[in-house]
């Protein structure tokens, strides 16, 4: 019965960008300005999102799609559809409740967002530290001490970091 009723529902013919207007014998009316319907068969249009304050408009609203926001400089998007803007920090920092704080020794952050992560523990891969880590950069692991025996012809490129962990100090 439900299936049959939905097939006979005149509102199901209303395409995206319109709504089924009960005040006008359920004819399909265009969404009013500043509103949209992204699917067919809608009984109302949704009000467009305003991208202001810490947000700014990435894409304006249309009758069939909501506005898309991004964040003003110094902030970055979080959440589905950029539902929040979070303050950027510098590389080598992470955002805490008290603001941006430097990464603790043994951790790094090479982005303006996210948390400080531990340096790679080269010894877990049987390798040695080729380049020390900093607040902004992970350590670079080099060949294992055995590979550096006399007669070794070249230094092999560092393997990609696999497992986080503290490097030996």
């Amino acid at each position: 019965f439900e299936r049959t009723r939905s097939l006979q529902d005149p509102c199901s013919n209303c395409p995206a960008g319109t709504f089924c207007d009960n005040n006008r014998n359920q004819i399909c009316s265009p969404c009013p300005p500043n509103s949209f319907s992204s699917a067919g068969g809608q009984r109302t249009c949704d009000i467009c999102r305003q991208c202001k304050g810490v947000f700014r408009t990435r894409k304006e609203c249309s009758s069939t799609s909501n506005a898309e926001c991004d964040c003003t400089p110094g902030f970055h998007c979080l959440g589905a559809g950029c539902s929040m803007c979070e303050q950027d920090c510098k590389q080598g920092q992470e955002l805490t409740k008290k603001g941006c704080k430097d990464c603790c020794f043994g951790t790094f952050n090479d982005q303006k967002r996210g948390i400080c992560r531990p340096w790679t523990n080269c010894s877990l891969d049987g390798k040695s530290v080729l380049v020390n880590g900093t607040k902004e950069r992970d350590v670079v692991c080099g060949p294992s001490p055995a590979d550096l025996s006399p007669g070794a012809s070249s230094v092999t490129p560092p393997a990609p970091a696999r497992e986080p962990g503290h490097s030996p100090q």
Epitope: I47, K52, K59, E60
Partner: antibody
Framework: EVQLVETGGGLVQPNGSLKLSCAAS????????MNWVRQAPGKGLEWIAR??????????YYADSVKDRFTISRDDSQSMLYLQMNNLKTEDTGMYYC??????WGQGTLVTVSA | DIQMTQSSSYLSVSLGGRVTVTCKAS??????LAWYQQKPGNAPRLLIF???SLETGVPSRFSGSASGNDYTLTITSLQTEDVATYYC?????????FGGGTKLEIK
Amino acid sequence: EVQLVETGGGLVQPNGSLKLSCAASGFIFNTNAMNWVRQAPGKGLEWIARIRSKINNYATYYADSVKDRFTISRDDSQSMLYLQMNNLKTEDTGMYYCNWDEAYWGQGTLVTVSA
Amino acid sequence: DIQMTQSSSYLSVSLGGRVTVTCKASDHINNWLAWYQQKPGNAPRLLIFGATSLETGVPSRFSGSASGNDYTLTITSLQTEDVATYYCQQYWSIPYTFGGGTKLEIK
């Protein structure tokens, strides 16, 4: 950083023409609507034109005071907004601002219509 | 067209005092109202959007409120740098319209 820089203002005689430009940077221009707002000397602000983006078929809107005389247009490849002003009247004298998203304004370009 | 009426063209104010600037819309604007501050020789600066939301970087002494079609900008503890002209604007319905402006003058 968002920047809107208007150019093209100047002195023009009544019934003359002028084309204003606005160079936009620091945001995604081609998916955003843009406005022109003007201000006569010592007077208030007046919205005069709006152009929407491709997703809205570049729809244009005008204040009654400039309809059929002014034309708003855009060049998305250059992130440029334009205002072609024809049949200028003395009452069109003022500072013309390019505006995006209510929050962002250029420094304005001065148009003087005088014999 | 929707008319935006700012009943006071001028307000005589005291530094450190509280100021309210009012604006009335002739029709429903769904709170799509902006308040701007403008100083001589400068472009307008957005203070409030959506009738009540403070724009980034604007001091918290500025606030906006709405009641029906009546809108208010409030400045608590007025500072010398707040002496300017304030405009409301509706951006709900084209043509977008501004109020006539309210100029603050020091007593």
